[in-house]
């Protein structure tokens, strides 16, 4: 009982349960392959508890090992379209600070119109994650087809 | 030491560790695109700790943010079959209560025979998740090819 | 406050936060379909906190329900290559002890060059997980394209 009370008295943040799930806002201008994300209850089922958005990119607020996951679906796409516009590639990485820049997760669409994956990775406070979509096809903005999120797992 | 003892004395459920992993039981009758799931140690490696099954659909027992994941493999399938029967689509959503009905995750098979994805989403006690497979192809019932699960992540 | 202090005094391991993320080391000799993994900060962003490697295979140190995830990308691959070398299949399973041998997760590449999936499964201390890649194509060793990990979720 003591544990339960103590748990209730502590803010969740002190337990390190940082978590975010984002929906696509828009793509970048030409020459900018980044996807720009948005999140918050006013937008539907997206949210940020701990991490925050910095110009549409996700910024980490707590050091730790995170589960990073993403799904991106191409709009107006068939397997023919996808193969004709190959290579279309999605990469998730730390883009800022540039001194810590690294690609964390990379997938090509080949003949498919959706990619989905996840991985565990250490992230530091201040790391900003960017999701780069290279190729000529555009992503769907449907919230059940394109989303991106992180979940703090342990220190 | 006090923390460790307190943790042992409390039922896990009070920590909010609701989790379920289900295996396919059967598909619905014609005009019912839902997949019907089953779970429990008697069936192999599937289980329900917190959530429960309601006529083959997964019902949530605790409010919170959940990681929802799914993999569905089509039976007797090749890339030729998959493209010939296109569109075959899988959607995971809240189907009940109707007032909260929403699609959470959607994927098409295109030229592939397996889809797999995951996402974070808020779910409330009483939400029932349905997995709709539309198209003429049937899913594999192999437990390592088709499965569906949720994991409570935080309040 | 008492909870916070107790939490700091306890080693993380006692909280059951076993987690590992591995990168591909090498494939096996002919007739051995297993992928051999490596992990640790000296190698980049891979790590083992709890589980350990036994001859390149992941061995579990704590009973519990785990989230197992994997992504494998084929090297020098296009959708044409992938379909020409079909079937190329990846299976993750318990390979030791032999008495507990079972396939947990299986995916075919069909016309794609990357597979990615995840699932919840109970694992016991001493279980060794093997990842078998059958077919003639080789996996990429790029750390953002091929990785394998587990995360302890609950007892």
């Amino acid at each position: 009982q003591r544990f339960a009370q103590a748990q209730q008295q502590l803010p969740l943040e002190s337990l390190g349960w940082d978590v975010a799930e984002l929906q696509l806002n828009h793509t970048g201008p030409q020459q900018d392959p980044r996807l720009y994300w948005q999140g918050g209850p006013a937008l539907g089922r997206s949210f940020l508890h701990g991490p925050e958005l910095d110009k549409g990119q996700l910024r980490i607020h707590r050091d730790g090992i995170y589960m990073v996951h993403i799904q991106v679906t191409l709009a107006i796409c068939s397997s023919t379209t996808a193969s004709r516009h190959h290579p279309t590639t999605l990469a998730v990485g730390i883009c800022s600070p540039a001194s810590r820049s690294i690609s964390l997760l990379r997938l090509s669409f080949h003949q498919g119109c959706t990619i989905a994956s996840q991985r565990l990775t250490p992230l530091a406070r201040g790391d900003t994650l960017c999701t780069n979509l290279t190729g000529t096809l555009l992503p769907s903005r449907n919230t059940d087809e394109t989303f991106f999120g992180v979940q703090w797992v342990r220190p | 030491q006090r923390f460790a003892q307190a943790q042992q004395q409390l039922p896990l459920e009070s920590l909010g560790w609701d989790v379920a992993e289900l295996q396919l039981n059967h598909t619905g009758p014609q005009q019912d695109p839902r997949l019907y799931w089953q779970g429990g140690p008697a069936l192999g490696r599937s289980f329900l700790h917190g959530p429960e099954l309601d006529k083959g659909q997964l019902r949530i027992h605790r409010d919170g943010i959940y990681m929802v994941h799914i993999q569905v493999t089509l039976a007797i399938c090749s890339s030729t079959t998959a493209s010939r029967h296109h569109p075959t689509t899988l959607a995971v959503g809240i189907c009940s209560p109707a007032s909260r009905s929403i699609s959470l995750l959607r994927l098409s098979f295109h030229q592939g025979c397996t889809i797999a994805s995951q996402r974070l989403t808020p779910l409330a006690r009483g939400d029932t998740l349905c997995t709709n497979l539309t198209g003429t192809l049937l899913p594999s019932r192999n437990t390592d090819e088709t499965f569906f699960g949720v994991q409570w992540v935080r309040p | 406050q008492r909870f916070a202090q107790a939490q700091q005094q306890l080693p993380l391991e006692s909280l059951g936060w076993d987690v590992a993320e591995l990168q591909l080391n090498h494939t096996g000799p002919q007739q051995d379909p297993r992928l051999y993994w490596q992990g640790g900060p000296a190698l980049g962003r891979s790590f083992l906190h709890g589980p350990e490697l036994d001859k390149g295979q992941l061995r579990i140190h704590r009973d519990g329900i785990y989230m197992v995830h994997i992504q494998v990308t084929l090297a020098i691959c296009s959708s044409t290559t992938a379909s020409r070398h079909h079937p190329t299949t990846l299976a993750v399973g318990i390979c030791s002890p032999a008495s507990r041998s079972i396939s947990l997760l299986r995916l075919s590449f069909h016309q794609g060059c990357t597979i990615a999936s995840q699932r919840l499964t109970p694992l016991a201390r001493g279980d060794t997980l093997c990842t078998n890649l059958t077919g003639t194509l080789l996996p990429s060793r790029n750390t953002d394209e091929t990785f394998f990990g587990v995360q302890w979720v609950r007892p």
Epitope: D54, D63, S96, P97, A98, S99, R100, P122, A124, R125, G126, T128 | - | G40, P41, A42, L43, G44, R45, F47
Partner: antibody, heavy 123, light 107 residues
Framework: QVQLVQSGAEVTKPGASVKVSCKAS????????IYWVRQAPGQGLEWMGW????????NYAQKFQDRVTMARDTSISTAYMELSRLRSDDTAVYYC????????????????WGQGTTVTVSA | DIQMTQSPSSLSASVGDRVILTCQAS??????LHWYQQKPGKAPKLLIY???DLETGVPSRFSGSGSGADFTFTISNLQPEDFATYYC?????????FGQGTRLEIK
């Protein structure tokens, strides 16, 4: 307590090389990046590069790329910085410093410094 | 390379004064900035990390603020031991670069 102890002062001629050592104690040597920073007389601080003591991986500032070598010996918790083809403007105090955060989370915040090694390059 | 410009280059103040130093980056560096103190003949000491977080053991009279390209470092109640040279350092891009320093002297 956590400390970094550097080797003693060096006087050397132009064109020669110098190797400075930095012995760590009081913490897990392999868990924190080591940085090398120099300071010419009456001047500011200049970053030379880093070494990850765990992997041995290095990153050098472009200015020193072709003249500097950073290494480590984990068995004695010691990092080394060797600068070759010395010139008179390499006369400076050379510092090693550790990152305040663990390997994955390094943020170039240097929380513990060596006492400095004076290197004088003179004909 | 990112240039870090500190101002003023030197400053005279008295014990008890409130002192504000500034550091300007040649481009946006978010909050990827640290502040150090160095006394003659000694190694630098980390005071503030990530623009505004106080390093453990550093007195609370020291504070930092700013984001983007403009940063300030404040000593709210100057003590005799605070007379030293202060450096800012960015880590947004490699190479890591320091400001030229601000020398704080007794008036």
């Amino acid at each position: 307590q956590v400390q970094l102890v550097q080797s003693g002062a060096e006087v050397t001629k132009p064109g020669a090389s110098v190797k400075v050592s930095c012995k760590a104690s009081g913490y897990t040597f392999t868990s924190h990046y080591i940085y090398w920073v120099r300071q010419a007389p009456g001047q500011g601080l200049e970053w030379m590069g880093w070494i990850n003591p765990n992997s041995g991986g290095t990153n050098y500032a472009q200015k020193f790329q072709d003249r500097v070598t950073m290494a480590r010996d984990t068995s004695i918790s010691t990092a080394y910085m060797e600068l070759s083809r010395l010139r008179s403007d390499d006369t400076a105090v050379y510092y090693c410093a550790k990152d305040r955060k663990r390997e994955y989370y390094y943020n170039f915040g240097m929380d513990v410094w060596g006492q400095g090694t004076t290197v004088t390059v003179s004909a | 390379d990112i240039q870090m410009t500190q101002s003023p280059s030197s400053l005279s103040a008295s014990v008890g004064d409130r002192v504000i130093l500034t550091c300007q980056a040649s481009q946006d560096i978010s909050n990827y900035l640290h502040w150090y103190q160095q006394k003659p003949g000694k190694a630098p000491k980390l005071l503030i990390y990530d623009a505004s977080d106080l390093e453990t053991g550093v007195p609370s009279r020291f504070s930092g603020s700013g984001s983007g390209a403009d940063f300030t470092f404040t000593i709210s109640n100057l003590q005799p031991e605070d007379f030293a040279t202060y450096y800012c350092q960015q880590y947004d891009h490699l190479p890591i670069t320091f400001g030229q320093g601000t020398r704080l002297e007794i008036k």
